[in-house]
């Protein structure tokens, strides 16, 4: 199940708080380190934060990405960092703040054809293999050459964003990666709160699309905290 | 378009086996999950299993663990479900279904009856 | 055993707006912000009608919507239309078993 698999050897030997829980050595299976975990400090409040391990960018928060906190540091070190605002230099898209994408290293405003969320090739190096598969180091599949010379429509398996076709993003889904669609106008979205533990993120979704945020929906004001829903709302 | 179309089930006894076959058309098969639900009569839909694209994943539901068996041939585009020691509450209509966002495209279902 | 429990028939009139109810626990659809509808007709194929709580597939009417709070969710259909009479099925995923699972069903009546 999900839940040995969380428990498994790929993440056991993480930084705290993912390594909290035993492992099962005999594990046939293990997923890649953080992308599920049962519980955590993920969502610490800002007052009491601390830095969440990492090995992608698509486990950070919409305002975060994935890198080492120190130039030239430990790569093998990583931990969800706040996200670049425009004109402040950059690497890859997922540096910049939502709304912005990296050009010649520079975070600048996106257009229709720059979404957020995508994912460096040098990621995959780190799993070795589809990650959605959640056979961690089993194997080396060969889903990349075999598979992505076309893009990959909604419902199809994908590594990253741009595996996906325009308008698509890559998303978790039960126990995959797959091409979802960009969030328009109204459509119920994941806020990424500082704030106890959220559970299994099992049901990623893409970020808003152009000109919109994700913000909490206002006939739920009165809702509990739980269970409140944030949609994609005009800025 | 997208077509799922299933095959053989039939009357069988109980403690027998069966293999029911699905074949795919219409998207590439190879780049999506795929999973069986069943049906019972005058039921409601009870997932069965799912496979992952490339076949190392395979989840199942409790009822059907150990003795069910979910298999893919992305060459063929076809999925299978063998099914061994069957039971009488093994009885239903047995559709397979893309599992894209969820179960997005289904086939038209083929019935399995456990019967002595 | 059935995860999810569904009101087992509603029934409206053409014109009518009707809601059908989902109910989970904390372990399953309370757990996540997602649910999945199913529409039914008698002897066919089910077919996707809302994901991800509130997402219409291309090709379903804008007259059918979903929402949650809490351990609830809820499919709505406005401008009830006789061709809505059918069996409604929602659909989540039980963190303790690591499945998906479905409602009991339920049955609306177009009068």
């Known amino acids: 199940t999900l839940n040995s698999v969380l428990n498994s050897n790929a993440i056991k030997n993480l930084p705290p708080p993912l390594g909290g829980a035993a492992g099962h050595p005999g594990s046939a299976v293990s997923a890649a380190p953080g992308i599920l975990y049962p519980g955590g400090n993920k969502y610490q409040t800002i007052d009491n934060y601390q830095p969440y391990p990492c090995a992608e960018d698509e486990e950070c928060g919409t305002d975060e990405y994935c890198a080492s906190p120190t130039r030239g540091g430990d790569a093998g070190v990583q931990i969800c960092l706040a996200c670049r605002k425009r004109r402040k230099r950059c690497m890859r898209h997922a540096m910049c703040c939502p709304g912005n994408y990296c050009k010649n290293g520079i975070c600048v405003s996106s257009d229709q054809n720059h979404f957020r969320g995508e994912i460096e090739e040098t990621i995959t190096e780190s799993f070795g293999n589809d990650h959605s598969t959640l056979d961690g180091y089993s194997r080396r599949t060969t889903l990349s050459s075999k598979m992505y010379h076309t893009k990959g429509q909604e419902g199809s398996v994908c590594l990253r964003s741009s595996d996906c076709a325009s308008g698509l993003c890559c998303a978790r889904h039960f126990w995959s990666k797959i091409c979802k669609p960009v969030l328009k106008e109204g459509q119920v979205c994941t806020k990424h709160r500082r704030k106890g533990s959220h559970g299994l993120e099992i049901f990623q979704r893409c970020y808003c699309g152009e000109g919109l945020s994700c913000r909490i929906q206002k006939d739920h004001h009165q809702a509990s905290n739980s269970s409140r829903l944030h949609t994609c709302q005009r800025h | 378009q997208v077509q799922l179309v299933e095959s053989g089930g039939g009357l069988v006894q109980p403690g027998g086996s069966l293999r029911l076959s699905c074949a795919a058309s219409?998207?590439?098969?190879?780049?999506?999950?795929m999973s069986w639900v069943r049906q019972a009569p005058g039921k409601g839909l009870e997932w069965v299993s799912v496979?992952?694209?490339?076949?190392?994943?395979?989840y199942y539901a409790d009822s059907v663990k150990g003795r069910f068996t979910i298999s893919r041939d992305n060459s063929k585009n076809t999925l299978y479900l063998q099914m061994n020691s069957l039971r009488a509450e093994d009885t239903a209509v047995y559709y397979c279904?893309?599992?894209?966002?969820?179960?997005?495209?289904w086939g038209q279902g083929t019935l399995v009856t456990v019967s002595s | 055993d059935i995860a999810l429990t569904q009101p087992a028939s509603v029934s409206g009139s053409p014109g009518q707006s009707i809601t059908i109810s989902c109910t989970g626990t904390?372990?399953?659809?309370?757990?996540?912000?997602?649910v999945s509808w199913y529409q039914q007709h008698p002897g066919k194929a089910p077919k996707l009608m809302i994901y991800?709580?509130?997402n219409r597939p291309s090709g379903v009417s804008n007259r059918f919507s979903g929402s949650k709070s809490g351990n609830t969710a809820s499919l709505t259909i406005s401008g009830l239309q006789a061709e809505d009479e059918a069996d409604y099925y929602c659909?989540?995923?039980?963190?303790?078993?690591?499945?998906?699972?479905f409602g009991g069903g339920t049955k609306l009546t177009v009068l």
């Open positions: 279904a893309r599992h894209g966002i969820d179960f997005d495209h």
């Open positions: 219409g998207f590439t098969f190879s780049s999506y999950w």
């Open positions: 496979i992952s694209s490339d076949s190392s994943s395979t």
């Open positions: 904390s372990s399953d659809l309370g757990g996540y912000n997602y």
């Open positions: 991800d709580v509130n």
């Open positions: 659909q989540s995923y039980d963190s303790p078993t690591d499945s998906v699972v």
